[in-house]
Amino acid sequence: YDFTNCDFEKIKAAYLSTISKDLITYMSGTKSTEFNNTVSCSNRPHCLTEIQSLTFNPTAGCASLAKEMFAMKTKAALAIWCPGYSETQINATQAMKKRRKRKVTTNKCLEQVSQLQGLWRRFNRPLLKQQ
């Protein structure tokens, strides 16, 4: 999916008002210096591509974050403010229902969500030069 035509300001507002808080809740009890940010993004469409991948694609050691509250809200924001995004999710939703697993917060998941926090922060500051 190409995130170029999303309403970035609306997505940013949703992040600032609610998604960011859910990410913090998920990470509660973890030191902010515990994980190094290894995933980066260069512009807003790229950031959303990375955010989607890290939020919804299962990875080794972290089977699924998709049922977490921050993920549900991310999915909603993309569906509402990214043209045509919802139709790409029809089959994905059916597949996710089939493989729904028990929620387990592993260290790998905490690391992944820490990366997500970094990506979201970068998304909110699109004019900053890449380090």
Epitope: A14, T18, K75, A76, I80, G84, S86, I90, T93
Partner: antibody, heavy 120, light 107 residues
Framework: QVQLVQSGAEVKKPGASVKVSCKAS????????MHWVRQAPGQGLEWMGT????????DYNQNFKGRVTMTTDTSTSTAYMELRSLRSDDTAVYYC?????????????WGQGTLVTVSS | EIVLTQSPGTLSLSPGERATLSCRAS??????VHWYQQKPGQAPRLLIK???QSISGIPDRFSGSGSGTDFTLTISRLEPEDFAVYYC?????????FGQGTKVEIK
């Protein structure tokens, strides 16, 4: 089963405001956005905007910007649409309709409609 | 804003005949089109979602097709209860919009 029950018909004077309610039951309220669509007598359907409880935010059709406010009360699973500075051409049936925001993505259930008549 | 144009405005047919309704979008919208039926004094009822996906409880004589800019709703054999107004809607991008409607009337 899923039900959206709207408030009763209203008669308003030009310049006044109207607030229409839509009480939802039979589903998880925050899993769906509530959209508002109106239909003037003998005319087609016009999307007015939506409120998304999950994100606690709204998005409006520019045609109504500044005149409309959409809210929800999650404790009672009720959505509200307030339209201000009413004009005679706001006379219409106003519908609420739910739409999934993390699945479904379509207006699959509608309220029965609320007739708002604007007349001096 | 995406404009949806439905044709014809009115379709005069007899029960048992096939009805073909068209909806054209002003720009490509992939498959983000849905079809609704509305009878006098009633709220719209969802018939088809995402261009061609069937809806539980809707008779299989209703079918949809198309993608991009051109979409079609087909009623294979008209029943007396099918005479109504039909609207297409796009949810590709905000603001969501509807076509102006096609009235299917008894000939």
């Amino acid at each position: 089963q899923v039900q959206l029950v709207q408030s009763g018909a209203e008669v308003k004077k030009p310049g006044a405001s109207v607030k229409v309610s839509c009480k939802a039951s039979g589903y998880i309220f925050t899993d769906y956005a509530m959209h508002w669509v109106r239909q003037a007598p003998g005319q087609g359907l016009e999307w007015m905007g939506t409120f998304i409880p999950l994100l606690d935010t709204s998005d409006y059709n520019q045609n109504f910007k500044g005149r409309v406010t959409m809210t929800t009360d999650t404790s009672t699973s009720t959505a509200y649409m307030e339209l201000r500075s009413l004009r005679s051409d706001d006379t219409a049936v106003y519908y609420c309709a739910r739409m999934g925001v993390t699945h479904s993505y379509v207006m699959d259930a509608w309220g029965q409609g609320t007739l708002v008549t604007v007349s001096s | 804003e995406i404009v949806l144009t439905q044709s014809p405005g009115t379709l005069s047919l007899s029960p048992g005949e096939r009805a073909t309704l068209s909806c054209r979008a002003s720009q490509p919208i992939s498959i983000s089109v849905h079809w609704y039926q509305q009878k006098p004094g009633q709220a719209p009822r969802l018939l088809i979602k995402f261009a061609s996906q069937s809806i539980s409880g809707i008779p299989d004589r209703f079918s949809g097709s198309g993608s991009g800019t051109d979409f079609t709703l087909t009623i294979s054999r008209l029943e007396p209860e099918d005479f109504a107004v039909y609207y297409c809607q796009q949810t590709f991008s905000l603001p969501y919009t509807f076509g102006q409607g096609t009235k299917v009337e008894i000939k």
